[in-house]
Interface confidence: medium
Amino acid sequence: MSSKYPRSVRRCLPLWALTLEAALILLFYFFTHYDASLEDQKGLVASYQVGQDLTVMAAIGLGFLTSSFRRHSWSSVAFNLFMLALGVQWAILLDGFLSQFPSGKVVITLFSIRLATMSALSVLISVDAVLGKVNLAQLVVMVLVEVTALGNLRMVISNIFNTDYHMNMMHIYVFAAYFGLSVAWCLPKPLPEGTEDKDQTATIPSLSAMLGALFLWMFWPSFNSALLRSPIERKNAVFNTYYAVAVSVVTAISGSSLAHPQGKISKTYVHSAVLAGGVAVGTSCHLIPSPWLAMVLGLVAGLISVGGAKYLPGCCNRVLGIPHSSIMGYNFSLLGLLGEIIYIVLLVLDTVGAGNGMIGFQVLLSIGELSLAIVIALMSGLLTGLLLNLKIWKAPHEAKYFDDQVFWKFPHLAVGF
């Protein structure tokens, strides 16, 4: 007998998703319109290209990066696309409502689409910790809650701490990591006997995960520079991110070999560590004055990432039920913190150099921003985890974790799981 969604989910998912989509269409109908200003064509094309880079990162990069499970690769890629498509729509509306709504209409520009794609990327980072343990109906809830939480966090940080788009979006790494880890903590953990093989990686899915990592690696400079307004800041952000990710690749591969008793290279370490430099320089990529400094950060980030990948999975597997290959959550949590600390250090050195007596205040503001991001991530993550545990979502049974056949039709298979 072929494996199916439970009957209740077959009713629940299409109804839930299509009702939500209809509601979004109505909201777009009543509250949005396109930017009618005279756009410079050259600027328009350049702006679109950045948005396109972000979409490639989200759909292909993060989609394939999370596809390394032996029996869950289809779901990883397709569910990522589903979440991205839904997340972008909701993020555009939410950002518009939070920032423009007093005018009565939300003006959609290429910049707002870029912002929305980055907000949706947050979900794709977080979901790495729970993919395989939840169904699409639950992922819809996760998208809505996380995009809403991130949007509100950004608005609060912008208003209280007076930070620009780039700075308040660069909390995305820490926010997404802690959100994902706290959701994972709430979900049922123990894998029953006999299903351990399903959360292991296989060669072909691992190759596609490496492809995802390569796409992310290529486009990470676009991500770190996407929200910077000034062309010069953007140029420096691109350069510094490029140098950082270049060094983190070399560090990841050599560090992975160093960490193995026989000097072998771990695919899992490499998938994630190649991105380490990009995450670490994210917050301060436009402020770093020299390539050498970005390269040092890439080196440190690569080492932290490999070290984390070696020693943290055991802990994360026991406490959070996160499989060994889903290392994005704790990787980003460590590297995001590193990036924030680097920014604070630059801030301190900056204010010392200027003979400014406000060092303590500035550092306090930065720590306040970071703490707020972590607290909101943990709280909203726990709330999401509790919501996902509700019976109405008909979550997959633990015995059917990490199994594409629960969700997909495979005509060539005579029997189901």
Epitope: E39, S47, N162, S230, I232, P289, D350, M358
Partner: antibody
């Protein structure tokens, strides 16, 4: 020689939309180190920054007026436009456009980006009245 | 938004006097502060950028200092053509670059 010249209607009725044009010469709107800002000054009052456009077409707006303002440019004609909707008598002011270069200073440990308005137009006076 | 407060709002001085105008930001803005001079019926003119850098063509009697929240514009020896209104402006915080309310320097 760098010059900026504002043009637009002298009189606007309340609730109407104001469109101002700034025609620049002596520098290129494509220059990565150059932007253009709009500033206004009501009679007898202080200067108020309204909006800014960078060479890469990124824009910044005054928080309080963001919902009413649109800045754009036509690089081929060396023109920058400011559109302000739902005009009110309190919007009566002299409107200036100004070249806004970005100076990058390399510190010991970080980069600094300084923005300032170094060349201003003469201004155009707009009265909002029915 | 970051607010900038200028003091005094007006002052009277004689030619040759040393004049100082203060500007205070509501939060630390590093050295992202500019000073402008505006004469009646004219457009403003940039004097100082980045708190202390003198704009080319501006007489050396004008100088700027300060960082963080407190800034000062000093005119070492006031000249007849210096009687005008002076504005400070912060460019630390995007998207809004705010101006002070101005200081009017009048003849005593």
């Amino acid at each position: 020689q760098v010059t900026l010249k504002e043009s637009g209607p002298v009189l606007v009725k309340p609730t109407e939309t104001l469109t101002l044009t700034c025609t620049v010469s002596g520098f290129s709107l494509n220059n990565a180190r150059m932007g253009v800002s709009w500033i206004r000054q009501p009679p007898g009052k202080a200067l108020e920054w309204l909006a800014h456009i960078f060479s890469n077409d990124e824009k910044s707006y005054s928080t309080s007026l963001k919902s009413r303002l649109t800045i754009s440019k036509d690089t081929s004609k060396s023109q920058v436009f400011l559109t302000m909707t739902n005009m009110d008598p309190v919007d009566t002011a002299t409107y200036y456009c100004a070249r806004t270069p970005i100076t990058m200073v390399r510190g010991a440990i970080r980069l600094y980006y300084y923005y300032y308005m170094d060349v201003w137009g003469k201004g155009t006076t707009v009265t909002v009245s029915s | 938004d970051i607010q900038v407060t200028q003091s005094p709002s007006s002052l009277s001085a004689s030619v040759g006097d040393r004049v100082t105008i203060n500007c205070r930001a509501s939060q630390s803005i590093g050295t992202y502060l500019n000073w402008y001079q505006q004469k009646p019926g004219k457009a403003p003119n940039l004097l100082i950028y980045a708190a202390s850098s003198l704009q080319s063509g501006v007489p050396s009697r004008f100088s700027g200092s300060g960082s963080g929240t407190d800034f000062t514009l000093t005119i070492s020896s006031l000249q007849p053509e210096d009687f005008a209104t002076y504005y400070c402006q912060q460019t630390y915080s995007t998207p809004t670059w705010t101006f002070g309310r101005g200081t009017k320097v009048e003849i005593k």
